[in-house]
Amino acid sequence: RQQWELQGDRRCQSQLERANLRPCEQHLMQKIQRDEDSYGRDPYSPSQDPYSPSPYDRRGAGSSQHQERCCNELNEFENNQRCMCEALQQIMENQSDRLQGRQQEQQFKRELRNLPQQCGLRAPQRCDLEVESGGRDRY
């Protein structure tokens, strides 16, 4: 069993290394920024990410592309719930520095938990998405 788990971990690691989780990150950021824009947040505030949604994109244009590609990537983990959880954790960790304030972080986490379901996939049970302070990119 231990040997199998070791192989499973290794397989998951290589799957994660080949996965492109950026579309998921963009899709989620679009979602929470669209929500915030409707509450009066300045949609033209600058971003460090060259592919962060423009104000034009945030109104919904282009977002289906990020979602479609994101779902394709998550679909690769469908047979391995633990690995799916690790992918979600990686998304959370990669974006944690870009999330402004506790409220945005909670909103991002909520959307992230719903992501597999949104893609028509099984959501991993008991997947801890808490990020230790100073989370950094694993890319």
């Epitope: 950026r22 282009g62 592309q65």
Partner: antibody, heavy 123, light 108 residues
Framework: EVQLVESGGGLVKPGGSLRLSCAAS????????MNWVRQAPGKGLEWVSS????????YYADSVKGRFTISRDNAKNSLHLQMNSLRDADTAVYYC????????????????WGNGTTVIVSS | EIVLTQSPGTLSLSPGERATLSCRAS???????LVWYQQKPGQAPRLLMY???TRATGIPDRFSGSGSGTDFTLTISRLEPEDFAVYYC?????????FGQGTKLEIK
């Protein structure tokens, strides 16, 4: 050397079938999404089909849906395109292309292409 | 499906001149999913730009890409003899992953 080599093209009658293959070498085949793209004589590029790393997501152009089937064998580093109910309009050079992405920013692109195999559908 | 329309169909210019190629989408395309390819007669396509504005490995800096939403542009600042070819834009965000019909860049 990273390489893709297509084979299986030829002359076939309308309504006939053909199976194209693409042999990959010089890279870890199972790490990449793969695509088929075709080009009719004197025309532009037309995307035909794509398949993800573990074959879990497959897409087709509307023009070939229900007639063509893409598949891959990661153990043999090969990509296939089964073409049934062929039409005159399917006459083209068929390219196999590897899809990669920019690790830091995320965009996808087809960075490695084969030289193509020619399919002629004619009575 | 997203339809990409390239213009002009043919562009006749001389070496040293500036070339501006346009790619217009029927609906918004995220920059992340806009790619440009170059193809010479009898050859397979070659990756030129991805993410709308990032040059692929080995592509000289006279090539640049810009645009967002539905309007994208490929610019070649000073044409070299080897740049005369057909150029295609492609979107790969929504299936089917469509190509534009191409712009032929020919020597005047």
């Amino acid at each position: 050397e990273v390489q893709l080599v297509e084979s299986g093209g030829g002359l076939v009658k309308p309504g006939g079938s053909l199976r194209l293959s693409c042999a990959a070498s010089g890279f870890i085949f199972s790490d990449y999404n793969m695509n088929w793209v075709r080009q009719a004589p004197g025309k532009g590029l037309e995307w035909v089909s794509s398949i993800t790393r573990s074959s879990r997501t497959i897409y087709y152009a509307d023009s070939v849906k229900g007639r063509f089937t893409i598949s891959r064998d990661n153990a043999k580093n090969s990509l296939h395109l089964q073409m049934n109910s062929l039409r005159d309009a399917d006459t083209a050079v068929y390219y196999c292309a590897r899809e990669d992405f920019d690790v830091s920013t995320g965009p996808y692109y087809m960075d490695v292409w084969g030289n193509g195999t020619t399919v002629i559908v004619s009575s | 499906e997203i339809v990409l329309t390239q213009s002009p169909g043919t562009l006749s210019l001389s070496p040293g001149e500036r070339a501006t190629l346009s790619c217009r989408a029927s609906q918004s395309v995220s920059n992340m999913f806009l790619v440009w390819y170059q193809q010479k007669p009898g050859q397979a396509p070659r990756l030129l730009m991805y993410g709308a504005s990032t040059r692929a490995t080995g592509i000289p800096d006279r090539f640049s890409g810009s645009g967002s939403g539905t309007d994208f542009t490929l610019t070649i600042s000073r044409l070299e003899p080897e740049d005369f070819a057909v150029y295609y834009c492609q979107q790969n965000g929504n299936s089917p992953y469509t190509f534009g019909q191409g712009t032929k860049l020919e020597i005047k």
